[in-house]
């Protein structure tokens, strides 16, 4: 708390300008009118206030707006945003994407802080869903944003928003998240032709089921090994050698280097060695000739 003291004669601020940087904390408190500050917030950013001085300015705004700042003030907070606590931000009602962009700009280049996370949460909840423009903005500032959401939160992403997603935005997503995003992407891109469709859907394939991978194998897509290695193991296991060869095209050579890693390792164990040999890759560990393959999952379903 800054002690209440009268403003010295002639020091009353008539506008927010650079002369204020020479004011002591108590002088700022006594001589700057909160309403004036609120109307001239856009000037604060251009003035090199110390962190202590910014604390005073924040205190003045808190007193003026105990229920939370109006958006007209929030939009011009600039570096003062870094002084806000998540509790402060929870009182705000941010509806403008421009306001969101302005505040994200202040935090640019840094990890997502609790303040930013709270701001985004408030904004998205206010909008009711994660629309394309919002997603575009958030992933531009935080490429990992999408993967920080829970599967439940992701379920509110409309398929139309998927167009804003770039491959790098999905780098840290786990299979549960891709399980939610893949069907949305499939829906969003359904009217594209073969090669264009594959380029767009590729990043989401970690959530694809077996039948979709089988369908892709018929389309000359030449999936690279990095994408193949991110596929769900349970979706890869039922693929035949011929299907994997068609799915990977010239990238099939890369299977040899990955033969000890999932899902390749587990897939090899499920294939007949004779079939693996036709790839000419030297893959070992398949089911030897003459062995009977029992599908235990089918047996359980029947019993």
């Amino acid at each position: 708390e800054v002690e209440k003291t009268a403003c010295p004669s002639g020091k009353k601020a008539r506008e927010i300008d650079e002369s204020l940087i020479f004011y002591k904390k108590w002088e700022l408190e006594a001589c700057v009118d909160a309403a004036l500050l609120a109307t001239q917030m856009d000037r604060v950013n251009a003035i090199p206030f110390t962190y202590e001085q910014l604390d005073v300015l924040k205190h003045k705004l808190d007193e003026l707006y105990p229920q939370g700042y109006p958006e007209s003030v929030i939009q011009h907070l600039g570096y003062l945003f870094l002084k806000m606590s998540p509790e402060d931000i929870r009182k705000w009602n941010v509806t403008s994407l421009e306001t969101l962009k302005a505040l994200l700009e202040v935090n640019k280049g840094h990890e997502m802080s609790p303040q930013v996370a709270t701001l985004i949460d408030r904004f998205v909840k206010g909008r009711g869903q994660l629309d394309k423009d919002t997603l575009d903005t958030l992933t531009a500032f935080y490429p990992g944003y999408l993967c920080s959401l829970s599967p439940e939160e992701l379920s509110s992403v409309p398929p139309s928003s998927i167009w804003a997603v770039r491959p790098q935005d999905l780098d840290t997503c786990d299979p549960r998240q891709l399980d939610v995003l893949y069907p949305k992407a499939r829906l969003a891109f359904q009217n594209m032709n073969g090669s264009e469709y594959f380029v767009k859907i590729q990043s989401f394939l970690g959530g694809a089921p077996t039948e979709d991978l089988k369908a892709l194998s018929q389309q000359n897509v030449s999936m690279d090994l990095a994408t193949f290695m991110k596929l769900r193991t349970d979706a890869v296991l039922p693929l035949t050698v011929a299907e994997v060869q068609k799915l990977l095209g010239p990238h099939v050579e890369g299977l040899k280097a990955e033969e000890r890693h999932r899902p390749v390792r587990d897939w090899i164990l499920r294939q007949r060695q004779d079939d693996l040999d036709t790839l000419g890759l030297g893959l070992q560990g398949g089911i030897p000739n003459g062995y009977l393959v029992l599908d235990l999952s089918m047996q359980e379903a029947l019993s």
């Epitope: 690279d224 010239p250 099939v252 050579e253 040999d277 036709t278 790839l279 000419g280 890759l281 030297g282």
Partner: antibody, heavy 119, light 107 residues
């Protein structure tokens, strides 16, 4: 370490025959498709012939079709190229090459053996 | 037969330079393209397969891109040991064919 060692090159007269061999080590030979590639002096690379993992399928460039025969002996880890009716334009260094997959690129090359067709 | 056309046929560059070699096929070959490096009196060495996948043990300064009919090999920062002849090759269909080669010489 994969090693491919060619032998059988030398000087031969036009119309003559020569048999090139390639001994493979450091790999399970029977698992890989193999091929022969040649390079005439001062020229670029030319694919000559290829053979599948089992030896059941063979492929030839038009320039050697009917004159050259590729074969493999998986029990001895050897690849062969029987060259008949040799011509001056067959003069080249012949490389034995392993394919990275049955339909793959050429990932390991031997050091080559020189075949000179001249009278 | 599929013709492979490489350009330039030769180029002069200095250590540290970024070098770009292009290869064009007479018909679409998807990503069925490989790049090889050959030094004088030596056998070729595989650099890249499937148009953009680096062979194991090949330095990351080499990269490949393209699909269909137009392909590129880039050496991001030329090293003394990179002065050699580079060949592209299609293995989409028989007969398998090579480009004419690009000789990278010291400026």
């Amino acid at each position: 370490e994969v090693q491919l060692l060619e032998s059988g090159g030398g000087l031969v007269q036009p119309g003559g025959s020569l048999r090139l061999s390639c001994a493979a080590s450091g790999l399970t030979f029977r698992n890989y498709a193999m091929t022969w590639v040649r390079q005439a002096p001062g020229k670029g690379l030319e694919w000559v012939s290829g053979i599948s993992v089992s030896g059941g399928s063979t492929y030839y460039a038009d320039s050697v079709k009917g004159r050259f025969t590729i074969s493999r002996d998986n029990s001895k880890n050897t690849l062969s190229l029987q060259m008949n009716s040799l011509r001056a334009e067959d003069t080249a260094v012949y490389y034995c090459v392993k394919r990275g997959a049955a339909v793959g690129s050429f990932d390991y090359w031997g050091q080559g053996t020189l075949v000179t067709v001249s009278s | 037969d599929i013709q492979m056309t490489q350009s330039p046929s030769s180029l002069s560059a200095s250590v540290g330079d970024r070098v770009t070699i292009t290869c064009r096929s007479s018909q679409g070959i998807g990503s069925w393209l490989a790049w090889y490096q050959q030094k004088p009196e030596k056998a070729p060495k595989s650099l890249i397969y499937a148009a953009s996948s680096l062979q194991s043990g090949v330095p990351s300064r080499f990269s490949g891109s393209g699909s269909g009919t137009d392909f590129t090999l880039i050496i991001s920062s030329l090293q003394p040991e990179d002065f050699a002849t580079y060949y592209c090759q299609q293995y989409n269909s028989y007969p398998l064919t090579f480009g004419g080669g690009t000789k990278v010489e010291i400026k």
